[in-house]
Interface confidence: low
């Protein structure tokens, strides 16, 4: 799997999980989240050569097409596969609220 | 939806469905498929600015991050959303076989 266990321990130019820490205030302009101040969102990036973690038959076809037609702009893209939620604390007035924001953390990637 | 009905009728630089015809022999080197000779595979391409058909909370966060940090390499990517199968005819020896290849045709796109 193109997850932290593989990607963060290997130098990999192909599609892989990349570390990205996001500070809510500085990076998103979100001042309403009290805790945490930021989080390890991570992101997916890298090339999608033929058969590199292809998600669907179409992405396999597209990467093969791209191999045979390298000048073509049609190629698969490295995107998130498994995502996890993030629990946040915020306030409505003086009332603390705890909420789980779904699909906030990327755990693994795929070529799609 | 970023499908043919919208994308093929609008000049759109942002993420959208793009037409792509694939000839099995010429473009993929596949000689085993007897019919069809090729098909409209289509593909997804284009920019993913903030809130443009974001697939997940993470892709929304990432596009907002990218707006505030335009020099960053972390940004969402335009990929397939809905896919359809393609029915093919091929031969094993002299015996014709009909098979449905799943996820061969892209019908719509998303920013992920």
């Amino acid at each position: 799997a193109l997850d932290a266990a593989y990607c963060f321990r290997n130098v990999q130019d192909n599609c892989c999980l990349r570390p990205l820490y996001i500070d809510f205030k500085r990076d998103l302009g979100w001042k309403w989240i009290h805790e945490p101040k930021g989080y390890n969102a991570n992101f997916c990036a890298g090339a999608c050569p033929y058969l590199w973690s292809s998600d669907t038959q179409h992405s396999r076809v597209l990467s093969l097409y791209n191999t045979i037609n390298p000048e073509a702009s049609a190629s698969p893209c490295c995107v998130s596969q498994d995502l996890e939620p993030l629990t946040i604390l915020y306030y409505i007035g003086k009332t603390p609220k705890i909420e789980q924001l779904s699909n906030m953390i990327v755990k693994s990637c795929k070529c799609s | 939806a970023l499908d043919a009905a919208y994308c093929f009728r609008n000049v759109q630089d942002n993420c959208c469905l793009r037409p792509l015809y694939i000839d099995f022999k010429r473009d993929l080197g596949w000689k085993w498929i007897h019919e069809p000779k090729g098909y409209n595979a289509n593909f997804c391409a284009g920019a993913c600015p903030y809130l443009w058909s974001s697939d997940t909370q993470h892709s929304r966060v990432l596009s907002l991050y990218n707006t505030i940090n335009p020099e960053a390499s972390a940004s969402p990517c335009c990929v397939s959303q809905d896919l359809e199968p393609l029915t093919i005819l091929y031969y094993i020896g002299k015996t014709p076989k009909i098979e449905q290849l799943s996820n061969m045709i892209v019908k719509s796109c998303k920013c992920s």
Partner: antibody, heavy 118, light 108 residues
């Protein structure tokens, strides 16, 4: 093999400026954070801050915020730690380290000894 | 700010098992890492992600982390294990923090 090579020892006077460097090789420089760690004579390790060279994000320990500046030039795979006005209390060994996303430092530089004395 | 507390020193007889603790608020909910530093040398990562060992680190080194305490265990201690050991973790803002360090002495 992965290496972090730091610039040589420095002897400076209080009030002077200084920029020390840490050059990464043997890996994709923009794919890992670089952290700076201070160790004063006979004392423990103190995290100063980190930079993500790929995104140019930085984060500083509150103890070092405004005291130092961390930067990087990804074109030459080098991270920097700089002071605009040194103090005698800045005398220490400074280490750079390659940092993985969840906070561990898997490779370290050899250290740069900075001595500030009038 | 987040703090990690370690004993100043730990002694162990040659060939016996040494345990070095590191305590911090809800430390078990975070990643905990351990570094070994010998005099005049840069630190070396010996345990990361609570209990994983980098290549080249002997199996005698192991880690655990639960509740408010992370523990570095060195079994069959050798003279060459004498060093300062630092635990490290981070708070919710990815502010890194080191423990104060523990001097390990191997007796005999």
């Amino acid at each position: 093999q992965v290496q972090l090579v730091q610039s040589g020892a420095e002897v400076k006077k209080p009030g002077e400026s200084l920029k020390i460097s840490c050059k990464g090789s043997g890996y994709s420089f923009t794919r890992y954070y670089v952290a700076w760690v201070r160790q004063m004579p006979g004392k423990g390790l103190e995290w100063m801050g980190w930079i993500d060279p790929g995104q140019s994000n930085t984060r500083y320990s509150p103890s070092f915020q405004g005291q130092v500046t961390i930067s990087a030039d990804k074109s030459i795979s080098t991270a920097y730690l700089q002071w605009s006005s040194l103090k005698a209390s800045d005398t220490a060994m400074y280490y750079c380290a390659r940092m993985l996303a969840w906070g561990w430092f898997d490779y370290w530089g050899q250290g740069t000894l900075v001595t500030v004395s009038s | 700010s987040y703090e990690l507390t370690q004993p100043l020193s730990v002694s162990v007889a040659l060939g016996q098992t040494a345990r070095i603790t590191c305590s911090g608020d809800n430390l078990g909910g975070y990643y905990a890492h351990w570094y070994q530093q010998k005099p005049g040398q840069a630190p070396v990562l010996v345990i990361y992600d609570k209990s994983d060992r980098p290549s080249g680190i002997p199996e005698r080194f192991s880690g655990s982390n639960s509740g408010n305490t992370a523990t570095l265990t060195i079994s069959r201690a050798q003279a060459g294990d004498e060093a300062d050991y630092y635990c490290a973790s981070y708070d919710s803002s990815l502010m890194m923090v080191f423990g104060g360090g523990t001097k390990l002495t191997v007796l005999g």
